[in-house]
Interface confidence: medium
């Protein structure tokens, strides 16, 4: 089921997922001066089984030089109304689809690719936001919204993230609280979810971290 | 003094690209402080005020290690380093490294 | 910065002893508090999230309450392993703060 709307825009703040749930589409879109090839994909797709998931589909650019206009991908009339851009990020996250069941991770750039990527979430997907560069934090979290299914409609969860400039005041005049009241840890919110389950999984495990210096150099 | 360091923090037993990454220090007999701290998923970090331009902190998330850097290196910089995990920045550093000792002498 | 100021600095208790132990925020915070304890040598460890809610395997004697710029800890009865220091910090902004760490030693 794809969500109806984009994720909720934070002022200042930018989101990304960490990995896709299946059934999510990326449009096959090429950067300027080039157009998708002659009978290619539209967009890839997220498929997969119970132990392995993957893309389906690659998308090709070729130069539309030959052309008199640059044709523009857009996406199809029933994807229209979940159209989500994310800008790309390099490098891009190494494709890893073993550690989140029933998820691809980004997908690798193909060749002159767009700058911007048109991503169509579906019922499920978790996206997680931080402040652009310049921007700090307020309420610091939870900095993530997923895509719920309510009465038969989708929504997105608001994340409880102000992102304010380093030259504003850090306390904005009566704002006394966060947007929700901290009433527990995302997995109540969520507890559905593949990617929250992981969460929880990771804290009965008894994560561990170690620390240990990489490098010193005294002079 | 006038060197620098690079502390890894290596997680296991889990998810790490969505967590944020703190690195907090501590001086013998003081508090904690924290230095800055990084999502890996989005890569870019964030740093207190105190520390910037001279800390860099990294992640690696297809070795799940976070990489802390501290340049310039004077004596007050002796401390414990510790790497800490935080459900996105709100619910608590809840797993924390066993810290690293850094000792800056002439 | 926000800061974070813990009272008392220091505290002497017996076993079996109500310990409290209170964080003043310099401006509101809401409900973003964190509580940890720490043992000499060792790691912090989270007690209290979110300010009451308790951490995952910590045992129930631990309590958080407050909310806006005055919070509390509370171990309800000191039991020999809690003689640690306990930090309070807000993660309601960016950086996060840490409170100074009151010690309670055994009187």
């Known amino acids: 089921e794809l969500c109806d709307d984009d994720p909720p825009e934070i002022p200042h703040a930018t989101f990304k997922a960490m990995a896709y749930k299946e059934g999510t589409m990326l449009n096959c879109e090429c950067k300027r001066g080039f157009r998708r090839i002659k009978s290619g994909s539209l967009y890839m797709l997220c498929t997969g089984n119970s132990s392995h998931s993957s893309w389906d589909n690659q998308c090709q650019c070729t130069s539309s030089a030959t052309r008199n206009t640059t044709k523009q991908v857009t996406p199809q009339p029933e994807e229209q109304k979940e159209r989500k851009t994310t800008e790309m990020q390099s490098p891009m996250q190494p494709v890893d689809q073993a550690s989140l069941p029933g998820h691809c991770r980004e997908p690798p750039p193909w060749e002159n690719e767009a700058t911007e990527r048109i991503y169509h979430f579906v019922v499920g997907q978790m996206v997680y936001y931080q402040c652009v560069q310049g921007y700090r934090a307020l309420h610091r979290g939870p900095a993530e919204s997923v895509c719920k299914m309510t009465h038969g409609k989708t929504r997105w969860t608001q994340p409880q993230l102000i992102c304010t400039g380093e030259m504003e005041t850090s306390q904005f005049p009566g704002e006394e609280k966060p947007q929700a009241s901290p009433e527990g840890r995302p997995e109540s919110e969520t507890s559905c979810l593949v990617t929250t389950t992981d969460f929880q999984i990771q804290t009965e495990m008894a994560a561990t971290m170690e620390t240990s210096i990489f490098t010193t150099e005294y002079q | 003094p006038g060197s620098s360091v690079k502390v890894s923090c290596k997680a296991s037993?889990?998810?790490?690209?969505?967590?944020?990454i703190s690195w907090v220090r501590q001086a013998p007999g003081q508090g904690l402080e924290w230095m800055g701290g990084?999502?890996?998923?989005?890569?870019?970090?964030n740093y207190a005020q105190k520390f910037q331009g001279r800390v860099t902190i990294t992640a690696d998330e297809s070795t799940s290690t976070a990489y802390m850097e501290l340049s310039s290196l004077r004596s007050e910089d002796t401390a414990v380093y510790y790497c800490?995990?935080?459900?996105?920045?709100?619910?608590?550093?809840?797993?924390w490294g066993q810290g690293t000792t850094v000792t800056v002498s002439s | 910065d926000i800061q974070m100021t813990q009272s008392p600095s220091s505290l002497s208790a017996s076993v079996g002893d109500r310990v409290t132990i209170t964080c003043r925020a310099s401006?509101?915070?809401?409900?973003?508090l964190n509580w940890y304890q720490q043992k000499p040598g060792k790691a912090p460890k989270l007690l209290i999230y979110?300010?009451?809610s308790l951490q995952s395997g910590v045992p129930s004697r631990f309590s958080g309450s407050g909310s806006g710029t005055d919070f509390t800890l509370t171990i309800s009865s000191l039991q020999p392993e809690d003689f640690a220091t306990y930090y309070c910090q807000q993660s309601y902004s960016t950086p996060p703060t840490f409170g100074q760490g009151p010690k309670v030693e055994i009187k």
């Open positions: 037993g889990g998810t790490f690209s969505s967590y944020a």
């Open positions: 979110a300010a009451s």
């Open positions: 990084i999502i890996p998923i989005f890569g870019t970090a």
């Open positions: 401006q509101s915070i809401s409900s973003y």
């Open positions: 800490a995990r935080e459900m996105y920045y709100y619910y608590g550093m809840d797993v």
